[in-house]
Interface confidence: medium
């Protein structure tokens, strides 16, 4: 009995899937804006995924969590740079700068200790991480409301 039900369910799912494929193909051929809308939806999904990545950042109101995150990111960044993984290392350093209470001071220190090309890479990535922080804060405020 269970086997029969499973077979029916599988058949229904298969039929639905084939139906969806036919619908998708017809829509793609007949609607000139379909491709654009699809691209737009994928862009939105990508953005949502990136926003979901914000969970990596600590609760900015929790000083202890921020400090722990800061130290971990500096260390990870440092170790990755030592291994020649400059891109990844810089990503972690920018995370640390983003949650740092005195980013200007930290940047001055990093300017002295990092090789110039690495420091330049860091500067180019800063606006992106700053935007992430702003998004994280606004998302947190939305949650409160």
């Amino acid at each position: 009995m269970v086997g029969r039900n499973s077979a029916i369910a599988a058949g229904v799912c298969g039929a639905l899937f084939i139906g969806y494929c036919i619908y998708f193909d017809r829509k793609r051929r007949s609607d000139p804006n379909f491709k654009n809308r699809l691209r737009e939806r994928r862009k939105k999904q990508k953005l949502a995924k990136e926003r979901a990545g914000l969970s990596k950042l600590p609760d900015l109101k929790d000083a202890e969590a921020v400090q722990k995150f800061f130290l971990e990111e500096i260390q990870l960044g440092e170790e990755l740079l030592a291994q020649g993984e400059y891109e990844k290392g810089v990503d972690h350093l920018t995370n640390a700068i983003a949650v740092c209470g005195q980013p200007q001071q930290l940047l001055q220190v990093l300017q002295q200790t990092l090789p110039p090309p690495v420091f330049q890479m860091l500067l180019t990535k800063l606006p992106t991480i700053s935007q992430r922080i702003v998004s994280a804060q606004s998302l947190a405020e939305d949650d409160v409301e």
Epitope: Q75, G77, E78, A82, V109, T113
Partner: nanobody
Amino acid sequence: AVQLVESGGGLVQAGGSLRLSCVASGSTFSNFVMGWYRQAPGKQRVLVATISSGGSTNYADSVKGRFTISRDNTKNTVYLQMNSLKPEDTSVYYCNARRGSVIVPTLAYDYWGQGTQVTVSS
């Protein structure tokens, strides 16, 4: 992050010897100053001995001449050889790894093991 796992603790008679080991994983071991600390029940954790990445050692006065700290960077391991043990050496012994940040000199990274019990009976 660095993980530290101690071993070698146990029960020993006064005057006996024990050798503690601490294996580090997760980072470049040779960059760290390694140390052993101990904590007796109801007391604060205190320094026993440290060894720098270059091999320079430092000991608490109470263990000088009896304990020897050493490290093997190829095995990511630090050792504490404890001779002429006394009942007052009874404690939980903790392994510690510490290093300053290269890129942010004011920062230090500090890691601790879970501890290993050493009991010296009289």
